[in-house]
């Protein structure tokens, strides 16, 4: 049996009918299913174009997946009285392309937010902080799930997608309490260097299935609570000494490095030495070379220094075309 990070209840649900009556505090919105016993509302695959206004005050888990929301404006979930119990909000696959500043304001108990599988052409720097102050009130978020939020190339803004996401993660230092961050499958070429320093409480970081080529400018030093670092399915060629030392210095971490195109030349020697003695890398016996051709599919743990050579660089006068 496998356990996912969010689960839905199997308690009975009440399907609501559209009503001409003014909404009662605990009435179920049209096109939704509600279970007060499970504190759960599901408005799933209903092609909703906006967040229902008449959500019951008891809602703790809200699923708004598979809709057509397009834009999440400021105060999209602000109600009077507020949705004070709402702890888990899943908006995945709802065709969101714009999340504006303050979209999640007035949700004092929001611990888990899933925006995965939305092509976010615009993510406001203040989407999670709700404030443009240099230091804003801390967000209650503990888990932020942003897998596959990269928009198609023709919908991208001029600025880098990595930079846009990073700005939202660090704004106002609001996410200092974040424990879990998933950023998988976003075509990231690099990780902006200041991001992790602003997320000191991280325990679980998933950067798998991106296009990261190097971690040279990324610092993990501050992430003393980090337990899981997922770097599978990237474009990593080698990890250099600085990165190796930082990872080894994290007291609790498990690192996942499968399915990267490791280049087994002279620059790989330090990493191989480290791999042989570290307990940090999960499944390290599965890591294999991708390049050069003569080394393809060799197991990194089985290499020695004699295997790891670099072709001498010819002086320009001797190079041939």
């Amino acid at each position: 049996t496998s356990s996912a990070s969010s689960s839905s209840s199997s308690a009975p649900f009440l399907a609501s009918a559209a009503s001409a009556q003014p909404p009662l505090p605990d009435q179920c919105p049209a096109l939704c299913e509600c279970s007060e016993a499970a504190r759960t509302v599901k408005c799933v695959n209903r092609n909703l174009t906006e967040v229902p206004t008449d959500l019951p005050l008891y809602v703790r888990n809200l699923f708004l997946t598979g809709n057509q929301l397009a834009v999440l404006p400021a105060g999209a979930f602000a109600r009077r009285p507020p949705l004070a119990e709402l702890a888990a909000l899943n908006l995945s696959g709802s065709r969101l392309d714009e999340v504006r500043g303050g979209a999640f304001e007035h949700l004092p108990s929001l611990r888990q937010l899933d925006l995965s599988h939305n092509p976010l052409a615009y993510l406001s720097p203040f989407a999670f902080s709700g404030s443009n102050a240099s230091i804003s009130a801390p967000s209650p978020l503990v888990e932020l799930i942003l897998n596959h939020i990269v928009p198609p190339d023709d919908k991208r803004q001029n600025r880098s997608f990595e930079g846009m996401v990073a700005a939202a993660l660090v704004a106002g230092r609001a996410l200092q309490g974040l424990h879990l961050l998933e950023l998988a499958s976003n075509h990231f070429l690099y990780l902006p260097r200041d991001v992790l320093a602003q997320l000191p409480s991280l325990r679980y970081l998933d950067l798998s299935n991106n296009s990261l080529v190097s971690l040279t400018y990324v610092s993990f030093r501050n992430l003393t609570h980090l337990e899981s670092l997922h770097l599978e399915d990237n474009a990593l060629k080698v990890l250099h000494n600085g990165t190796l030392a930082e990872l080894q210095g994290l007291p609790h971490v498990r690192v996942f490095l499968d399915n990267n195109p490791w280049v087994c030349d002279c620059h790989m020697a330090d990493m191989v030495t480290w791999l042989k003695q570290t307990g940090v890398v999960q499944g390290k016996d599965r890591l294999t070379c991708a390049f050069p051709e003569k080394m393809r599919n060799r197991v990194l743990l089985e290499l020695n220094s004699a295997d790891l050579d670099c072709d001498p660089i010819l002086p320009p006068s001797l190079q041939t075309s």
Partner: nanobody
Amino acid sequence: EVQLVESGGGLVQPGGSLRLSCAASGFTFSSYAMSWVRQAPGKEREWVASITTAGGSTRYADSVKGRFTISRDNAKNTLYLQMNSLRAEDTAVYYCNAELGPRRLGMDYWGQGTLVTVSS
């Protein structure tokens, strides 16, 4: 198929001891760090202890430090938790946890749990 099967739970008096076991199959046990996690009635799951691949490094929640010992036998594909000086607040279902890959891919595996009850 990944399987984790816990055993060794039961009723014990305060101050007593128990040894939990977790038999693992379906993956290369020796390649992965492992953990014990517990859930007391009406409470959230709480991490208890972890151990690295070869057992060279262990760590513990403050609440169990000095009383519990995590260990593993890679030849037997088994994880252990020796629990001494048990207290009423240790009453919980204890789960063995193996994280083999990203959670979003369903690669965070749990056993069915074994109940430990500490009561006089």
